[in-house]
């Protein structure tokens, strides 16, 4: 279906945050889901081929969080 | 703005291990909820997903192939790399990265073609 | 893992037609749903996120839309650029999967 690749046509960025409105980026699923329906993670099961995530849901301060600091953003905008 | 561009070796033999690398900018894998994935096509078929790797490095993997997937990162220098193990001429694809965020993949790379052939 | 089934995977059509893509989900994925074009050289845009969110910058005349397990993309009136390649892509679950892609061709 493809024939050759070409350069690169960028859009413009969106705002940091992932989720429209009324949306929380929700850990285990690791997409976002309605704010209401978020729930706590699960430990990570040994061995697992798409690991559930490892930390609880914490505010959302740090736009930067890194492993081990994963944040519940607010609603935010795409 | 948002630009990813792979890169490979275009061609490499059979039993070899191929080595990708996503180059992006106008983003962090530091920031909360980003991730980095790839897909390939064959030339004249679908897209097929292989792996992505988040922020937080949690990865994930295409169940069939992932014995021979590695993907990585390096956050400070924007990039992030797959690598295929024992390649074989049906792996001959056009190799994408692509931006994750909420919403899967919402920036994609021009794409690097690799082509197995002994 | 969960398998999309898209038609048709040609279609041919008129400049100005109403058209309508089908991709349809093997099991639940409410509405982790997307719709990618693919241009003759292999450039790939997200045109439509959630089901049925136009991402910024694509014409209104792509819709999105779903009706249990069936998820549509409509074009409202067929431009000359938009005949290429589409795909439906589900992330509610790893591993994500394509569908197989529709060629849009002109009649």
């Known amino acids: 279906m493809r024939r050759g690749p070409r350069s690169l046509r960028g859009r413009d960025a969106p705002a940091p945050t992932p989720c429209v409105p009324a949306e929380c980026f929700d850990l285990l699923v690791r997409h976002c889901v309605a704010c209401g329906l978020l729930r706590t993670p699960r430990p990570k099961p040994a061995g697992a081929s798409s690991p559930a995530p490892r930390t609880a849901l914490q505010p959302q301060e740090s736009v930067g969080a890194g492993a081990g600091e994963a944040a519940l953003p607010l609603p935010g905008l795409l | 703005q948002v630009t990813l561009k792979e890169s490979g070796p275009g061609i490499l033999q059979p039993s070899q291990t191929l080595s990708l690398t996503c180059s992006f900018s106008?983003?962090?894998?530091?920031?909360?909820?980003?991730?980095v994935g790839w897909i390939r096509q064959p030339s004249g078929k679908g897209l097929e997903w292989l792996a992505h790797i988040w922020w937080d490095d949690d990865k994930y993997y295409n169940s069939v192939l992932k014995s021979r997937l590695t993907i990585s990162k390096d956050t400070s220098k924007n990039q992030v790399f797959l690598k295929i193990a024992n390649v074989d001429t049906a792996d001959t694809a056009t190799y994408y990265c692509?931006?994750?965020?909420?919403?899967?993949?919402?920036?994609w790379g021009q794409g690097t073609s690799v082509t197995v052939s002994s | 893992d969960i398998q999309m089934t898209q038609s048709p995977s040609s279609l041919s059509a008129s400049l100005g037609e109403r058209v309508s893509l089908t991709c349809r989900a093997s099991q639940d994925i409410g509405n982790n749903l997307n719709w990618l074009q693919q241009e003759p050289d292999g450039t790939i845009k997200r045109l439509i996120f959630?089901?049925?969110r136009l991402d910024s910058g694509v014409p209104k005349r792509f819709s999105g839309s779903r009706s249990g397990s069936d998820y549509s993309l409509t074009i409202s009136s067929l431009e000359s650029e938009d005949f290429v390649d589409y795909y439906c892509l589900q992330y509610a679950s790893s591993p994500y999967t394509f569908g197989g892609g529709t060629k849009l061709e002109i009649k």
């Open positions: 692509a931006r994750l965020g909420g919403y899967a993949m919402d920036y």
């Open positions: 959630a089901t049925s």
């Open positions: 106008g983003f962090s894998l530091s920031t909360f909820a980003m991730g």
